[in-house]
Interface confidence: medium
């Protein structure tokens, strides 16, 4: 069965200064490749978190991504401000050479 990316929460309400939890799960280990979180869609979308590389000081993962069969890619974003408002997408990439390829979005 083909991998699905599931974002169960249609909206999340967070007070300024608090932490937002954005939930995302995948239904399969295959295809192998990282999850990335974006705010917005299309060419101008903003990268919020990349599981594979980069430094995202306000973002932590909800679960231990080093555990074998954990397919929970939920994140927490700390110290929320009004500027963080928007629609967030959890996107699965397929591992490729030389570049990973977008596979499916929540």
């Amino acid at each position: 069965e083909e991998l699905q990316v599931i974002q169960p929460d249609k909206s999340v309400l967070v007070a300024a200064g608090e932490t937002a939890t954005l939930r995302c799960t995948a239904t399969s280990l295959i295809p192998v490749g990282p999850i990335q979180w974006f705010r917005g869609a299309g060419p101008g979308r903003e990268l919020i978190y990349n599981q594979k590389e980069g430094h995202f000081p306000r973002v932590t993962t909800v679960s231990d991504l080093t555990k074998r069969n954990n397919m929970d890619f939920s994140i927490r974003i700390g110290n929320i401000t009004p500027a963080d408002a928007g629609t967030y997408y959890c996107v699965k990439f397929r591992k490729g050479s030389p570049d990973d390829v977008e596979f499916k979005s929540g």
């Epitope: 295959i30 991504l65 080093t66």
Partner: antibody, heavy 121, light 112 residues
Framework: QVQLVQSGAEVKKPGASVKVSCKAS????????ISWVRQAPGQGLEWMGW????????NYAQKLQGRVTMTTDTSTSTAYMELRSLRSDDTAVYYC??????????????WGRGTLVTVSS | DIVMTQSPLSLPVTPGEPASISCRSS???????????LDWYLQKPGQSPQLLIY???NRASGVPDRFSGSGSGTDFTLKISRVEAEDVGVYYC?????????FGGGTKVEIK
Amino acid sequence: QVQLVQSGAEVKKPGASVKVSCKASGYTFTSYGISWVRQAPGQGLEWMGWISTYNGNTNYAQKLQGRVTMTTDTSTSTAYMELRSLRSDDTAVYYCARDQGTGTTVDLDLWGRGTLVTVSS
Amino acid sequence: DIVMTQSPLSLPVTPGEPASISCRSSQSLLHSNGYNYLDWYLQKPGQSPQLLIYLGSNRASGVPDRFSGSGSGTDFTLKISRVEAEDVGVYYCMQAQGTPYTFGGGTKVEIK
């Protein structure tokens, strides 16, 4: 680029300890575990254990339990493997390998170049 | 511990010809999630091992399509459809179904 760089060769006396380092670069260190694998001269591969870079949880091979300690320093993206009470049969090349990044990779997809540890009186 | 048995121990091959390596485990490597936790690695002379196949049949990134993995449960096979000179080295299967991970004894592939 994505790589694991290991510390240099060591020569130790029986009964001594050795600590091998493995510095990761080019990827998010805490998204992948680290396994340590050793290879005695002319022999096959032996898995020593695994550490979660996320929370420091470890899983050691039973035969090394009590002699091996695996740690990480997330501030420098470095994993360490310390082996104590060294014996001559611990002479081997010690490899670190990137392991178990959920959904990102499965098992040992990136290896260091190895560190030769020689135990000799 | 799960015991991994590889055969043959040594495999002389002719470039352009196919080659096959067998790996058998003492316990099933089929996880309840439907995946077989069996990998294949190649250690070329003087180098670190490199991942070829994961989860029994999935080629790792950058691995040529002449390599394929098959099998389920306790019996697995690595096939090279047409051996090239650069394929020489020692091939290892490894189970990651349970800890400790265990490797097969290795199969040395050399050119005839």
